[in-house]
Each structure stands twice: as structure tokens, then as C-alpha cells.
């Protein structure tokens, strides 16, 4: 998977008046990394691993960047005409990626009241707008505002892309990100299903990076896809991920089944417990 940095900023208006604060979150490699603390007007790391990425360096640069981005987005919202009464939001999501072959991608997306209305591929300078008339009107509105100085706009987006990649590379220089390996905790549980059947669930949690193989085996052979149910691989809020896989088996056949896990070149197998729960840390 590529390394990525994702900025998510939201500004609000009430009865046509743009509010002074803004909401901001930054994700690094899909993990919550920074957020903007509105009370302290500072960028704050999300969890210990985020603090470890920069070590003892301050977060002044991140604070400055987010503050500037928030200001720009408030100005954009102010130029959206025909804002109805009540609460409205303008959200900007910016993503830059560095792929294994060192190629880069960068994109930007605008949402009004949670609805996407404008996207840009920064490298190709290609803008796309959804078909709906509301999206078309909003996009025209925002693009006209952004195009007031066409050259400045072009330079602005390329600079923004370059800044994003520069920040991403700076974070990646930290061995915490590049060499980070956190083995999963694996636990297998069982629950009664229909008569004569039980559901066995294998959960892997607190692992990093995101890529993982988790599958049920019968007599050492992987079960077919259609007999297993998988959960998404999701961030667990601690800079690590979690996922699960479940299958239904006949009561009395538990000994034939194991959960197989593979992560970062290491693997383990986990039996179905005879009682209710079994928690095993994979010690590599």
C-alpha cells in the first residue's frame, strides 16, 4: 500500500455567517495522526505513536499549516452564494500519496453539507464535478472564486501538493513509521448459533501495518470464501488496526478448526477454545 497523508478540514456557517473556528484532522497511512485543538489553537498529535513520529520536535509547523488552510477554507465558504438559513458546512479533503515505485498522487475534494461537489487531480489539474445540478452550481461558484487569479491558483495547488509530499516524506523519515511493526493480538471466541451449530469468531487487534491475512482452516485447509464472513480492517484509535473473521461450524467438530493469521512475514494458528474465550498474543 502507498504511504499517504490525508487532511480533512471543515468550516461552518450559521445563517450565512461563517464561523470563526474550524475542525481539522490529519491521517498518516490511514491512521488518525493530528487534530486541531480549537481551545488551544494548536495541532495536537493523536496518541503516543503520533508523538513518537516527530520525537521531541514541536508541532509549530503543523499548527501554522492547519491554521492557514482553515483560513483559506473559511474564505471559500464565504463566497458560496445562496446559503440558506441554519447550519451549513464546507469540507475539504486533501490527500497526497507516495507509491512503492516513488511515483506520487495528489487529490483534493470539496463537500458542501456532506455532499461531494468538486474534485481535483492535482497532477493533471483535472477537475471533476458530479452530475447533480446542486453540485454543478456549487462547483461553478467555488471555481469562480478560486480562479480570480488563475496563475496564483495553479501555483497555489502545486505548492500545496509539494508541501503535502514534503511533510509526508518528513514523517516517513521517522523509523517509527517506516519500520513500525506491531504484531496482532489474536483471540478466538465461540457463540451458540442454531441448534447443533456454533459460530466461531477470530479477532485480530492492535496490529500495524494494515495488511493482514486472517482465515479459518478446517483440518489445516483454508475454508472457501463463501463459508466465511470478514470484517473490514479498521483503525482502532491507537495507531493500529483491527479486523475479524467468522464461520459457522458443527458442535463437536471444534478440534478440526483453527484460525490462521499472517502479518508482516510472521504467522500463527489459533484453536477454537473449549470454553468461552481464549486470548493469545503472538510472540515473535
Amino acid at each position: 500500500e502507498p504511504h499517504s497523508l490525508r487532511y480533512n478540514l471543515t468550516v461552518l456557517s450559521w445563517d450565512g455567517s461563517v464561523q470563526s473556528g474550524f475542525l481539522a484532522e490529519v491521517h498518516l497511512d490511514g491512521q488518525p495522526f493530528l487534530r486541531y485543538d480549537r481551545q488551544k489553537c494548536r495541532a495536537k498529535p493523536q496518541g503516543q505513536w503520533a508523538e513518537d513520529v516527530l520525537g521531541n520536535k514541536t508541532w509549530d509547523r503543523e499548527t501554522r499549516d492547519l491554521t492557514g488552510n482553515g483560513k483559506d477554507l473559511r474564505m471559500t465558504l464565504a463566497h458560496i452564494k445562496d446559503q440558506k438559513e441554519g447550519l451549513h458546512s464546507l469540507q475539504e479533503i486533501r490527500v497526497c500519496e507516495i507509491h512503492e515505485d516513488n511515483s506520487t498522487r495528489s487529490s483534493q475534494h470539496f463537500y458542501y453539507d456532506g455532499e461531494l461537489f468538486l474534485s481535483q487531480n492535482v497532477e493533471t489539474e483535472e477537475w471533476t464535478v458530479p452530475q447533480s445540478s446542486r453540485a454543478q452550481t456549487l462547483a461553478m461558484n467555488v471555481r469562480n472564486f478560486l480562479k480570480e487569479d488563475a496563475m496564483k491558483t495553479k501555483t497555489h495547488y502545486h505548492a500545496m501538493h509539494a508541501d503535502c509530499l514534503q511533510e509526508l516524506r518528513r514523517y516517513l523519515e521517522s523509523s517509527v513509521v517506516l519500520r513500525r511493526r506491531v504484531p496482532p493480538m489474536v483471540n478466538v471466541t465461540r457463540s451458540e448459533a442454531s441448534e447443533g451449530n456454533i459460530t466461531v469468531t477470530c479477532r485480530a487487534s492492535s496490529f500495524y501495518p494494515r495488511n493482514i491475512t486472517l482465515t479459518w482452516r478446517q483440518d489445516g485447509v483454508s475454508l472457501s470464501h463463501d463459508t466465511q464472513q470478514w470484517g473490514d480492517v479498521l483503525p482502532d484509535g491507537n495507531g493500529t488496526y483491527q479486523t475479524w473473521v467468522a464461520t459457522r461450524i458443527c458442535q463437536g467438530e471444534e478440534q478440526r478448526f483453527t484460525c490462521y493469521m499472517e502479518h508482516s512475514g510472521n504467522h500463527s494458528t489459533h484453536p477454537v477454545p473449549s470454553g468461552k474465550v481464549l486470548v493469545l498474543q503472538s510472540h515473535w
Epitope: D219, G220, T258
Partner: antibody, heavy 118, light 107 residues
């Protein structure tokens, strides 16, 4: 490539025990189960049991419970099958096999002839 | 235990012939059937797993079919190197059980 190399032929007296080894190479030893099978002279194949080399879990054919014990030594990537209280009808070729997680008994050892004779 | 009845127990065929070997299970085995080749002095080889899936490196002249209790191994055009004993295995229910084997010879 996956290779399973079994120990050499054994001649044992009735009542004795024998331990057959199966050394694996060409893959991560603890990834896949080991299965043991026997073939008596002029007979078909019989499944004895299997072992998960990661945590040592075993499943036996009821017929061989108390007769066969399956173990592994991770440090040498070797699976073992010990047979006790040998009788003349335990004379057979004993095979180990492993899997690729897609199929049972995917790769086989060359077999070990155990002869039980007084 | 599930009984696996394999037939014929031996057969003689000419190079280029189409050869069919069958295995019948004493109860439904839900396609969990493998076919193996046993040649004297060589390790046993997996040919087909889960009724019809060809194991990697196995020539395409080998194929498998069947469902429920009846399963078939077919060699579309017999080659001299196919001289061996063939047997089936059911992997659906413990204990795993094998067919008695079919000894294939060249006429």
C-alpha cells in the same frame, strides 16, 4: 520447493516402540499441518492423525488413539510419529504428508517401512 | 466411517486411450475428494483436489468430476509415464478414508 524426507526403515520386536521422523524444507515449517498415513502390505492407505506444528494441536483417527503419538520439533523443522506396543499387524509403510492450505495431503514423504517381527 | 469403493481395482489400456477410474462414497462427501498417483520408488503425487481442481504442475490430460457420492478421474490420452496406482481420498468427514487403489498398466 517443498520436500519431506523421512527416516530409514526400522525392524522392531513385538511390544517395542518406534519413532519415525519427517524433516521438512522449502517452506515455513509451522505454517502447515502434518498428516500421517500408513499402508500395510497389499492393503489400502489408512489415515493415522495430524498435528498443527504451530501450537502442537493433534487430531487422531480413533483407531490409532493410544497407538500413535504425533509431535514436532520446530528447531529442526521435523515432525515425528511414535508408535508403541508394536504388533506384527503394524508392519507397514508409514508416510508423512503436508498441505499448501488448499488441499489435504498435498506433498508426501518417501515413506518409512516399519517391520514388526519376532 | 465413510467407505470409499474404487473401481476397477486394475485396468490395462493402450497409449492414447481415454481412461476412467471411479470412486463411490458410502455417503455424501460434498465434493471433498482428492485423487493421487503412486509410482514405485517415487513420492505419492496429488493430482486433483476438491473433485475437479488440478494441482499445479499436473498435466491437463488429468481431470476430475462428480458430486454427492460418485466421483471420476479421467486421463484423456494415456501416456507411458502414467503407469501407476491411483487412489482417491475423502476429506469431508473424520476419519479421512482412502479408496483401495486402481493399478493402471499399459497393454
Amino acid at each position: 520447493q517443498v520436500q519431506l524426507v523421512q527416516s530409514g526403515a526400522e525392524v522392531k520386536k513385538p511390544g517395542a516402540s518406534v519413532k519415525v521422523s519427517c524433516k521438512a524444507s522449502g517452506y515455513a515449517f509451522t505454517k502447515y499441518n502434518f498428516y500421517w498415513v500408513r499402508q500395510a502390505p497389499g492393503q489400502g492407505l489408512e489415515w493415522i492423525g495430524y498435528i498443527d506444528p504451530y501450537f502442537g494441536g493433534t487430531v487422531y483417527n480413533q483407531k490409532f488413539k493410544g497407538k500413535a503419538t504425533l509431535t514436532v520439533d520446530k528447531s529442526t523443522s521435523t515432525a515425528y510419529m511414535e508408535l508403541r506396543s508394536l504388533r506384527s499387524d503394524d508392519t507397514a509403510v508409514y508416510y508423512c504428508a503436508t498441505t499448501d492450505a488448499y488441499s489435504l495431503f498435498t506433498y508426501w514423504g518417501q515413506g518409512t517401512l516399519v517391520t514388526v517381527s519376532s | 466411517d465413510i467407505q470409499m469403493t474404487q473401481s476397477p481395482s486394475s485396468l490395462s489400456a493402450s497409449v492414447g486411450d481415454r481412461v476412467t477410474i471411479t470412486c463411490r462414497a458410502s455417503q455424501d462427501i460434498s465434493n471433498y475428494l482428492n485423487w493421487y498417483q503412486q509410482t514405485p520408488g517415487k513420492a505419492v503425487k496429488l493430482l486433483i483436489y476438491y473433485t475437479s481442481r488440478l494441482h499445479s504442475g499436473v498435466p491437463s490430460r488429468f481431470s476430475g468430476s462428480g458430486s454427492g457420492t460418485d466421483y471420476t478421474l479421467t486421463i484423456s490420452s494415456l501416456q507411458p509415464e502414467d503407469i501407476a496406482t491411483y487412489f482417491c481420498l475423502q476429506g469431508n468427514t473424520l476419519p479421512f478414508t482412502f479408496g483401495q487403489g486402481t493399478k493402471l498398466e499399459i497393454k
